[in-house]
Interface confidence: medium
């Protein structure tokens, strides 16, 4: 029950990449609005994004702050024009989220290949370390900064005359890998949480190219 | 094994200076943020500075009790860190802690054994 | 700088007690407050994080609470391992460590 006219959210759902955190749901709001709370297991409720007729709700400021906590959000809907107006049982209608731990379950971003350098028959490859919007003490925190060690990175790495891909892993932003002497080489990268259960691999990173602006070569 | 090794302490008269070094081993150095904390005889510790990783430009970070005198610095090269103490002060007395500095949630997860600081005329 | 004010400096207790110390924050720190546990010897080890937060592998009977400019930190079940050092630390702006409370058992 709840108002004339008001209907619970539902489809609640988590979207989520390197810890940029907004909460969906559905319907478009017909003559109602939308205030969300979130909260941990053990702590108090805060309010966000009051009276709102969008669907959706930024709430990475709040999870940022710790990120391997458990998160619960609920929306509740309120009459357009009347948000005092509760349902019958004295509170406004409200639909819960379902459960969400950062840092298991936020996607990881598309990671993207910095440089690479070819000294004789070896390559350097190096990843980028991705900016989050985890903050602290005045500056936003990398990927690595936030994962440490549960992140690695595997390198997809293929001559370019060629399909045969190898593989090589790293628990740091570096690769050093062998190469044929006077071959072109390709690379991309894919960031990795082996210890996680869902989410565990990022998307791979645009393909980069010997012999193309970003890499550097000196042969010694 | 991680292992971080502290050098340069000794004495030192007022107003003067001292380096103080750091030998980082066992892990990719660029990737860490490091860190200087003190603790004077008998007292608490003491943040001191850090120096953010190479994500972060390697950007520095003082207490107020020591900044405009003291300066952190590393050489990646060496996998070293340093910290420049200038116009000391008898309070600046303590043995000096670096550490690496895990920003997410401000853990001090290894440390070095400390070098001692006098400053006394 | 933001001030921590810890007490109290020292305290003795018996094993199976439960203990408290507090730490005061000169300003607002939202949650951002550690504990620390030192022991001669040994670097000092982090027990709670973001306010009551337990580091994996710290043992249940440590914990903390609070928010804003005043912390608790309590352990329940004193143990004799538990002899050491114990400090707050705030990493809202910087890094500010409290003065320490040294805690003995009778």
């Known amino acids: 029950s709840g108002t004339t006219n008001t209907v619970a959210a539902y489809n609640l759902t988590w979207k989520s990449t390197n810890f940029k955190t907004i909460l969906e749901w559905e319907p478009k709001p017909v003559n109602q609005v939308y205030t969300v709370q979130i909260s941990t297991k053990s702590g108090d409720w805060k309010s966000k994004c009051f009276y709102t007729t969008d669907t959706e709700c930024d709430l990475t400021d709040e999870i940022v702050k710790d990120v391997k906590q458990t998160y619960l959000a609920r929306v509740f809907s309120y009459p357009a024009g009347n948000v005092e107006s509760t349902g019958s049982a004295g509170e406004p209608l409200y639909e819960n989220s379902p459960e969400f731990t950062p840092y298991l379950e936020t996607n990881l971003g598309q990671p993207t290949i910095q440089s690479f350098e070819q000294v004789g028959t070896k390559v350097n490859v190096t990843v980028e370390d991705e900016r989050t919007l985890v903050r602290r003490n005045n500056t936003f925190l990398s990927l690595r900064d936030v994962f440490g060690k549960d992140l690695i990175y595997t390198l997809y790495y293929w001559k370019s005359s060629s399909s045969g891909k190898k593989t090589a892993k790293t628990n740091t932003n570096e690769f050093l890998i062998d190469v044929d002497k006077g071959e072109n080489y390709c690379f991309s990268v894919q960031a990795v949480i082996p210890s996680r259960t869902v989410n565990r691999k990022s998307t791979d990173s645009p393909v980069e190219c010997m012999g193309q602006e970003k890499g550097e070569f000196r042969e010694i | 094994e991680v292992q971080l090794v502290e050098s340069g302490g000794g004495l030192v008269q007022p107003g003067g200076s001292l380096r103080l070094s750091c030998a980082a081993s066992?892990?990719?150095?660029?990737?860490?943020?490091m860190s200087w904390v003190r603790q004077a005889p008998g007292k608490g510790l003491e943040w001191v500075g850090f120096?953010?990783?190479?994500?972060?430009?390697?950007?520095?970070e003082y207490a107020a009790s020591v900044k405009g005198r003291f300066t952190i610095s590393r050489d990646n090269s060496k996998n070293s860190l340093y910290l420049q103490m200038n116009t000391l002060r008898t309070e600046d007395t303590a043995v000096y802690y670096c550490?690496?500095?895990?920003?997410?949630?401000?853990?001090?997860?290894?440390w070095g054994q400390g070098t001692l600081v006098t400053v006394s005329s | 700088d933001i001030q921590m004010t810890q007490s109290p400096s020292s305290l003795s207790a018996s094993v199976g007690d439960r203990v408290t110390i507090t730490c005061q924050a000169s300003?607002?720190?939202?949650?951002?407050l550690n504990w620390y546990q030192h022991k001669p010897g040994k670097g000092p080890k982090l027990l709670i994080y973001?306010?009551?937060t337990l580091q994996t592998g710290v043992p249940s009977r440590f914990s903390g609470s609070g928010s804003g400019t005043d912390f608790t930190f309590t352990v329940s079940n004193l143990q004799p391992e538990d002899i050491a050092t114990y400090y707050c630390?705030?990493?809202?702006?910087?890094?500010?460590f409290g003065q320490g409370t040294k805690l003995e058992i009778k």
């Open positions: 550490a690496r500095l895990t920003m997410v949630v401000a853990e001090f997860d290894y």
């Open positions: 630390l705030q990493y809202d702006n910087l890094l500010t």
């Open positions: 120096i953010r990783n190479r994500a972060q430009g390697y950007t520095t």
């Open positions: 973001y306010t009551s």
């Open positions: 066992g892990f990719t150095f660029t990737e860490y943020h």
């Open positions: 300003q607002d720190i939202n949650k951002y």
